[in-house]
Interface confidence: medium
């Protein structure tokens, strides 16, 4: 690495993966290991971080990227970066501080993560309830009670939703 | 850099039609809840309701049901917030955030506050 | 619905330690969050889940729980600390994901 030059801040010249050393004349040195610095002119790089227990390693620390953490099978990510790991339940169940439990009555989770929402209220929108909901599912609506004939069509389910509220992996 | 920009202030007399809104960027806008937070003067924070644009439900606060539309044009990324005839109680600030849920319910994002000022 | 519990205010020496609650039923089923409003700001998610700290949130402020009441501590209280902090949860008596948030509490550092 070559010493920089600039007369205004002689570190702006050090590039991402290195950081300006003070101790060595502001010479640009090379991030040691496990460390990063994304950005160039940095004055220290920083420490990556690691995936330990249930986090495990999406994307390695490079010498100018931070290490990407996941959650190991039966968790799910929380939170900006996923700094937090959260069990996975079943459908038809929610997390609480007790762990899973059963949706009550009158609400879903298709999901294996999220929260238990009410039911589809279908005559609301002037329909009937074609399929009647469960635990792991909404409930289907159909036409209205008037607009059903032998020649009706049939009506297909809705596509399950996103998993709501949590953060994409 | 993920933020949510809201709307600029508002002055409006009692009686007439407003809508506000929140524009979320730098995330995948389709997989959080957006929940709307009002702050009266001088008070603390009150939830309004939210959509989830995943599947465009909405869920509000029983005591803003009917007194507020909350919707959202997926297409670009924006909640929106609206009245159809403001009264004077409605001086607030409104607040648009991001919420998750999980063993609990967790605002990690918030827009900027959009003052709604009504008064004749 | 149920209700979240909060002093309305506490004040702390700076440099010392102070803890903040907020009670409710639904803290028995789900973890409260916490925020940081100061004048003419948006809040700021302190704490949520099971004593998480978002980042750049300093570890001088903690949360813990016991049965329906939850903790926010500051130790260390520091000038900028000063504030209002409100918690916040979900609503156990309702089929519906609904959201309660405490009155707040309005922390003056001497």
């Known amino acids: 690495f070559e010493r920089t030059r600039s007369l205004q801040d002689p570190c702006s010249n050090c590039p991402a993966g290195t950081f300006c050393d003070n101790n060595r004349n502001q010479i640009c040195s090379p991030c040691p290991p496990n460390s990063f610095s994304s950005a160039g002119g940095q004055r220290t790089c920083d420490i990556c971080r690691q995936c330990k227990g249930v986090f495990r390693t999406r994307k390695e620390c490079s010498s100018t990227s931070n290490a990407e953490c996941d959650c190991t099978p039966g968790f799910h990510c929380l939170g900006a970066g996923c700094s937090m790991c959260e069990q996975d339940c079943k459908q038809g169940q929610e997390l609480t501080k007790k762990g899973c439990k059963d949706c009550c009555f009158g609400t879903f989770n298709d999901q294996k993560r999220g929260i238990c929402r009410p039911w589809t209220n279908c005559s609301l929108d002037g329909k009937s309830v074609l399929v009647n909901g469960t635990k792991e599912r909404d409930v289907v609506c159909g036409p209205s009670p008037a607009d059903l004939s032998p020649g009706a069509s049939s009506v297909t389910p809705p596509a399950p939703a996103r998993e709501p509220g949590h953060s994409p992996q | 850099q993920m933020q949510l920009v809201q709307s600029g202030a508002e002055v409006k007399k009692p009686g007439e039609s407003l809508k506000i809104s929140c524009k979320g960027s730098?995330?995948?806008?389709?997989?959080?809840?957006i929940a709307w937070v009002r702050q009266m003067p001088g008070k603390g924070l009150e939830w309004m309701g939210m959509?989830?644009?995943?599947?465009?439900?909405?869920t509000y606060n029983p005591s803003f049901q009917g007194q507020v539309i909350i919707s959202a044009d997926k297409s670009i990324n924006t909640a929106y917030l609206q009245w159809s005839s403001l009264k004077a109680s409605d001086t607030a600030v409104y607040y648009c955030?991001?919420?998750?849920?999980?063993?609990?319910?967790?605002?990690?994002?918030w827009g900027q506050g959009t003052l709604v000022t009504v008064s004749s | 619905s149920s209700e979240l519990t909060q002093d309305p205010a506490v004040s702390v020496a700076l440099g010392q330690t102070v803890r903040i609650t907020c009670q409710g039923d639904?803290?028995?089923?789900?973890?409260a969050s916490w925020y940081q409003q100061k004048p003419g700001q948006a809040p700021r998610l302190l704490m949520y889940?099971?004593?998480i700290r978002p980042s750049g949130i300093p570890d001088r402020f903690s949360g813990t729980d016991s049965g329906n009441t939850a903790f926010l501590t500051i130790t260390g209280a520091q000038a900028e600390d000063e504030a209002d902090y409100y918690c916040?949860?979900?609503?156990?008596?309702?089929?519906?994901?609904?959201?309660?948030f405490g009155g707040g509490t309005k922390v003056t550092v001497l």
């Open positions: 639904s803290l028995r089923r789900y973890y």
């Open positions: 730098g995330y995948n806008f389709t997989n959080y809840f």
């Open positions: 955030a991001r919420a998750f849920y999980a063993a609990g319910n967790y605002f990690d994002y």
């Open positions: 959509f989830y644009p995943g599947d465009s439900k909405t």
């Open positions: 916040n949860s979900r609503d156990t008596n309702a089929n519906q994901p609904l959201v309660l």
């Open positions: 889940g099971k004593n």
